[in-house]
């Protein structure tokens, strides 16, 4: 294309082509003609004396690029009840739907919208949600490694560490937190048979622990005296 700006339509010089981005070559007219901008379509093609005539796309229709389309494209149908609309249908872009929380996209469209959402898998007790996702976006579960646990069935909960106890009553395992012995002024005087209920872990107070490979000894072991449950809070 010559260096100077040339108004369409024009006949390209030998060895030159039309500007690809905003022009097209009309074989019938044998001219370089203007494409229509995003949001419009070709109402009338060009001829040797007059350029392309463009018109706005109608409601629920769009064109996203400079084009020589005879009609605008139809926007995708409305998002389903398990989806959220993250981009509305306009004259210049298609509607984009994404899966609501707790679901993943099992079938994507070429435009990046989601055609079919599926409920995320849940990881059961002893398993936590892995930091990476499956190729299809579903949750991956991983077994809680020693020193960590998950006592929930969830698509979001990760394995978290056992609490560190001042006095440990029952060691934690992959599906339960460590149980700490409660503080009592009489503990040192009374041999203790443990009836310690499992504290309900909460998001705001994950736990502390220390570990090692244990062949879990008898839970009725005498526990020594005095201590307090030391809980911890998640940093940040």
């Amino acid at each position: 294309v010559p260096a100077q700006v040339v108004l369409t339509p024009y006949k390209p010089e030998p060895g030159y082509e039309c500007q690809i981005s905003q022009e097209y070559y009309d074989r019938k007219a044998q001219m370089c003609c203007a494409k229509c901008p995003p949001g419009q379509y070709v109402k009338h093609f060009c001829n040797k004396t007059s350029d392309t005539v463009c018109a706005d796309c109608e409601a629920s229709m769009y064109t996203q690029v400079w084009n020589q389309f005879r009609t605008c494209l139809s926007c995708s149908s409305s998002c389903t009840t398990d989806q959220v609309e993250i981009r509305a249908c306009t004259k210049q872009q298609n509607r984009v739907c994404a899966c609501e929380a707790g679901r993943y996209c099992a079938l994507k469209t070429h435009s990046g919208s989601c055609r079919q959402c599926m409920r995320l898998s849940k990881c059961g007790p002893g398993f936590g949600v892995a930091s990476s996702r499956a190729p299809n976006g579903n949750v991956l579960c991983k077994a809680c490694a020693p020193g960590t646990f998950s006592d929930t069935t969830s698509s979001t909960d990760v394995c978290r560490p056992h609490r560190i106890c001042s006095i440990l009553a029952i060691p934690g395992n992959a599906s339960t937190d460590a149980v700490c012995a409660p503080e009592s002024p009489t503990l040192s005087a009374i041999p203790r048979t443990l009836y310690v209920s499992q504290p309900e872990p909460t998001r705001s107070q994950p736990l502390d622990q220390e570990p090692g490979p244990s062949q879990t000894p008898s839970i009725l072991t005498s526990l020594g005296s005095t201590p307090i449950i030391e809980q911890s809070t998640k940093g940040g």
Partner: antibody
Framework: QSLEESGGDLVVPGTSLTLTCTAS?????????MCWVRQAPGKGLEWIAC????????TYYASWAKGRFTVSRTSSTTATLQMTSLTAADTATYFC??????????????????????WGPGTLVTVSS | ALVMTQTPASVSAAVGGTVTINCQAS??????LAWYQQKPGQPPKLLIY???YLTSGVPSRFKGSGSGTEYTLTISGVQCDDAATYYC????????????FGGGTEVVVK
């Protein structure tokens, strides 16, 4: 709860020494690992070994400490660290520290979360001629 | 052998400022990382475990983060009492990997 080390001394190279860690306010046999960590003057921390204080008394050592250092549980409230063939490089404050155990299911012989949450004040061992 | 590389060796901060200490493991330790604070003449104190969990009584100005081989301790709103040496520790021990401490970072508060 507290831990206290004893037995630190000035000894000559080539000799042996036994350090004792005494627990107060809790029973060593209650699901704890008792560990030893040392710190040379003005230097960083160096893990030595741990012993599972319950029944089996399983131990694990830093590779450099195997053979020369031995941990054991002598009672429900005491653990010891025996050190042999001492050299000047062993001069350090020796701390005992504890970490608690957990069930490991299939993870036989594996210890992961060795978090030392309770420490003694330390005892100084000086090896010098 | 697992090596924990801690940087910087020393850092100075004004009261109210922020201190960042980095710890790099020579292999993936899967968040099994602890941070300790040690003051002269005292034993270390466990501040943070499993990379980001604060132990009981530790002020919320201490924050641990990181995963894999890279970990960070951040102290926001530094106070005079925070002057100490801080150590990271890989709490990952297995049949072929030993727990190891970083070299320490001295925090000086101006």
């Amino acid at each position: 709860q507290s831990l206290e080390e004893s037995g630190g001394d000035l000894v000559v190279p080539g000799t042996s020494l036994t350090l004792t860690c005494t627990a107060s306010g809790f029973d060593l046999s209650s699901f704890y690992y008792m560990c030893w960590v040392r710190q040379a003057p003005g230097k960083g921390l160096e893990w030595i070994a741990c012993i599972y204080a319950v029944s089996s008394g399983s131990t694990y050592y830093a590779s450099w400490a195997k053979g020369r250092f031995t941990v054991s549980r002598t009672s429900s409230t005491t653990a010891t660290l025996q050190m042999t063939s001492l050299t000047a490089a062993d001069t350090a404050t020796y701390f005992c520290a504890r970490h608690q155990s957990y069930e490991t299911y299939g993870y036989v012989g594996v210890v992961y979360a060795t978090y030392f949450s309770l420490w003694g004040p330390g005892t100084l061992v000086t090896v010098s001629s | 052998a697992l090596v924990m590389t801690q940087t910087p060796a020393s850092v100075s901060a004004a009261v109210g400022g922020t201190v960042t200490i980095n710890c790099q493991a020579s292999e993936d330790i899967d968040s099994y990382l602890a941070w300790y604070q040690q003051k002269p003449g005292q034993p270390p104190k466990l501040l943070i475990y499993y990379a980001s969990y604060l132990t009981s009584g530790v002020p919320s100005r201490f924050k641990g983060s990181g995963s894999g081989t890279e970990y960070t301790l951040t102290i926001s709103g530094v106070q005079c009492d925070d002057a100490a040496t801080y150590y990271c520790q890989s709490a990952f021990y297995s049949n072929n990997t030993e727990t190891a401490f970083g070299g320490g970072t001295e925090v000086v508060v101006k």
